[in-house]
């Protein structure tokens, strides 16, 4: 089989026939050096998954539940291409499983026990697997058989396709539990009708069901959605209030050597030639000899799944939790109101050591998880491997786009009521050596630059955003002659000045000596012309405050700030000479962990925060001798956010807009993956 062949897996005679037609029609339109199709027939989707894992086939299209199976070891497959529905302008690759209730009913998600439930059908995704999977650990024991546990949880249900003889309560609201449209409460519309008629208190459907059944907004306003955080939202806010976000139909391939670029090239060309309304003789999204053969008949086209996206991220935390609960059937010993330990994400070994010390001192209230980059940490928090970390504003933006929420903000100024008063922010500045007297904001081209890291606020987003507005392109590595911006591509001129050894060169963690505020300032001291840092960096590392050999003899007076008007000012005049105000660093977590992270961190700062006077003999949460490990070293306390509890509200409109503009220049693979899930 030539190298550019994609071996498509078919699961029936009809699929194999369509696959052969697909193969032949592709041959007729694609040059001989282009991608081609070969067909492999297997008895089932699970056999196809195994065949791809064993390198006997390359691709197959799967529903969400099977994407989960495909991801599990030893298969280790990943999503590579998604089918989309709707229009090319507004492509829908996901649907949302929701819990719909009547507006006046007054109960929340955690009060569903004893209510009457309407389901689309037993074993179906939005109507059964997701809600029951998420409620699984609240079901009465024994939880097997599952139908019995569900019957004992709700006071009555309509779950079409259930066995009405063995589990009569599941058919109480729709006698007989008929498994077709003959049952008026079957399917999405049926489950909604069950709620609408007053038979049930809650309907588990998908987000579009309400809109398809109620054209009139005034009618829709009689209903609400139950959110997982035990609040309610209007039905059109399903993106912020759902049980799970579910991919509709996805092509999977091997994680390693999986031909993902070739598969995309093939399918992209296929949709050009044989997509919706393209060709009479062969149609990719049509099944004359059956239904949904190879691809869904309702699909409109394909979108490439970003390479950073593994199956866990693609399926989302809620969906994976629901399906894992159903499959594995494991729950904590007894559900308690006690918070589980918070799994803190630590970057590289320096932060891990501090985190371990915190863990020991917290007596297990804190556990530690390691990752090599901030983005890897954010991904671990998203998928539940970790729970929380403190982030610079630039990463609060990425985390927010990935569905995480800020919970507490670092405060840097001593005040009587520190924990109750989140600050307005700190200043992003450009520092130069006083001796380089001709250097101004207007003649930085060709100079050597020092940055905290790519994607961070003071070190990147603010200065590069301002620069972008001036030069109108993203080739910052051409603007500066060389520099150190940890997280840049290793062959970039913006890694040339970095000092990390071997693989650690230019890494966005403390293994790179020029990483972070202190690192960027050190870069200026030793090699650079300008450093982009925070207003406190120079005083914190001069006058003997940093005992490291490179810093111990530095004098604040030997450095100046560049002002945007082309002038320069002494370091202490940052309030009148800065690039922008930056939002303080903040702790982020998943929505489901928000309350516990808040509670445990407030306890921890009372034990190990700024009130600890002797850090040589005691653990201090906000100290690491200028290394800013886990938290900035100048943190005085972690403050409540009050109503600034989303990333947009926390960062502020101006900063969100600035980072949004810089998105054109973003190299963040995680941001790309997260905006695929939520454009």
């Amino acid at each position: 089989v030539p190298d550019k062949t994609v071996r498509w897996c078919a699961v029936s005679e009809h699929e194999a026939t369509k696959c052969q037609s697909f193969r032949d029609h592709m041959k007729s339109v694609i040059p001989s050096d282009g991608p081609s199709v070969a067909c492999v027939k297997k008895a089932s989707y699970l056999d196809c998954i195994r065949a791809i894992a064993a390198n006997e086939a390359d691709a197959v299209t799967l529903d969400a539940g099977l994407v989960y199976d495909a991801y599990l070891a030893p298969n280790n497959l990943k999503p590579v291409v998604a089918e989309f529905y709707g229009s090319k302008e507004d492509p829908q690759t996901f649907y949302y499983a929701v819990a719909v209730v009547k507006k006046d009913s007054g109960f929340q998600m955690n009060q569903l026990r004893g209510k009457k439930s309407c389901h689309t059908g037993l074993g179906r995704s939005a109507g059964w697997n997701i809600p029951i999977g998420l409620l699984y650990c609240d079901l009465p024991e024994p939880r097997k058989p599952l139908e019995k546990a569900v019957a004992n949880f709700f006071s009555g249900s309509c779950a079409p396709c259930a066995d009405g003889t063995d589990f009569p309560q599941l058919c109480q609201l729709c006698p007989g539990c008929g498994c077709s449209t003959l049952n008026q409460y079957f399917g999405y519309s049926g489950a909604f009708k069950c709620l609408k008629d007053g038979a049930g208190d809650v309907a588990f459907v998908k987000h579009s069901t309400i809109f398809e059944n109620l054209a009139n907004k005034a009618d829709r306003d009689q209903y609400e959605l139950l959110c997982l955080d035990n609040t309610r939202k209007p039905v059109d806010e399903y993106k912020d209030c759902h049980l799970a976000q579910v991919p509709s139909h996805t092509v999977v391939a091997r994680s390693m050597g999986g031909k993902e670029d070739l598969i995309w090239e093939l399918l992209n060309q296929a949709q050009e030639h044989f997509g919706k309304d393209k060709s009479k003789e062969f149609q990719l999204f049509s099944s004359p000899h059956g239904k949904d053969l190879l691809f869904k008949d309702s699909a409109h086209g394909f979108l490439k799944v970003p390479p950073r996206m593994d199956a866990k991220m693609y399926l989302g935390y809620e969906y994976v939790t629901a399906i894992r609960n159903l499959r594995e059937g494991t729950c904590p010993e007894a559900p308690t109101d006690e918070c589980k330990p918070v799994k803190w994400c630590a970057l590289s070994h320096h932060e891990r050591l501090k985190c371990d010390e915190w863990s020991v001192n917290s007596v297990g209230k804190i556990e530690c998880v390691s990752a090599e980059t901030t983005e890897d940490c954010i991904a671990k928090i998203m998928n539940g491997e970790a729970d929380a970390m403190s982030l610079d504003g630039g990463f609060v933006y990425i985390a927010g786009k990935c569905g995480l929420v800020p919970v507490l903000a670092e405060n840097y100024n001593k005040s009587d009521n520190c924990e109750d008063t989140p600050e307005a922010g700190y200043f992003a500045i450009a520092v130069v050596k006083k001796s380089a007297s001709d250097l101004t904001w207007d003649n930085l081209k060709g100079k050597k630059s020092c940055h905290t890291a790519v994607g961070r606020t003071a070190g990147w987003n603010i200065p590069m955003g301002l620069l972008y507005n001036k030069i109108n392109h993203c080739r910052f590595d051409e603007f500066f002659s060389e520099g150190c911006a940890p997280g840049s591509k290793k062959d970039s001129s913006l890694c040339k000045l970095c000092m990390g050894s071997g693989l650690n060169l230019c890494e966005p963690n403390n293994k790179e000596g020029y990483y972070g505020y202190t690192g960027a300032f050190r870069c200026l001291v030793e090699k650079g012309d300008v450093a982009f840092v925070k207003h406190q960096t120079v005083p914190q590392n001069t006058g003997g405050k940093n005992p490291d050999p490179w810093a111990k003899n530095l004098n604040e007076k030997d450095y100046e700030l560049l002002c945007l008007d082309g002038t320069r000012k002494p370091v202490e005049e940052y309030a009148n000479c800065h690039l922008a105000r930056a939002p303080n660093h903040a702790v982020v977590t998943r929505k489901d962990k928000e309350a516990c992270v808040h509670k445990i961190l407030r306890q921890q700062q009372h034990l190990f925060g700024s009130n600890v006077t002797d850090c040589s003999g005691n653990f201090c949460l906000f100290r690491s001798e200028t290394k800013d490990l886990l938290f900035r070293d100048d943190t005085v306390c972690l403050a409540k956010l009050h109503d600034r509890n989303t990333y947009e509200k926390y960062l502020g409109e101006e900063y969100v807009k600035a980072v949004g503009n810089l998105r054109k220049c973003s190299t963040s693979s995680l941001l790309e993956a997260c905006t695929f899930r939520r454009p």
């Epitope: 070994h349 320096h350 932060e351 050591l353 501090k354 010390e357 020991v360 001192n361 007596v363 040589s616 003999g617 005691n618 653990f619 100290r623 690491s624 001798e625 290394k627 490990l629």
Partner: nanobody, 117 residues
Framework: QVKLEESGGGLVQPGGSLTLSCAAS????????MAWYRQAPGKQRELVAG???????NYAGSVKGRFTISRDNAKNTVYLQMNSLKPEDTAVYYC???????????WGQGTQVTVSS
């Protein structure tokens, strides 16, 4: 600077016991939390157990109930009593005092523990 020296490792059969010791010398007034780590071949170094100056202890889930960490402040020594040893406990065991405030990796030689029949 605090200097740490680990000892007490060896070869032991599954189910057996060992006690590791770590003696500290130097500017020990600054020692607060002490901990035992281990590193198996090809694996990351991981925290096994820790103890604060006041004697508060914490353990990795995999050793809870089998290992006990203790310290003798008068002798500036921390111990790790390891019972019901399993083959997966095989590793080089290191102790650390965290007084270096997480600067570079400054680990001692460690002591090898091998659990095998």
């Amino acid at each position: 600077q605090v200097k740490l020296e680990e000892s007490g490792g060896g070869l032991v059969q599954p189910g057996g016991s060992l006690t590791l010791s770590c003696a500290a010398s130097g500017s020990i007034f600054s020692i607060n939390t002490m901990a035992w780590y281990r590193q198996a071949p090809g694996k990351q170094r991981e925290l096994v157990a820790g103890i604060t100056r006041s004697g508060t202890t914490n353990y990795a889930g995999s050793v809870k109930g089998r290992f006990t960490i203790s310290r003798d402040n008068a002798k500036n020594t921390v111990y790790l009593q390891m019972n019901s040893l399993k083959p997966e406990d095989t590793a080089v065991y290191y102790c650390t005092d965290y007084s270096r405030k997480y600067y570079e990796d400054q680990w001692g030689q460690g002591t090898q523990v091998t659990v095998s029949s």
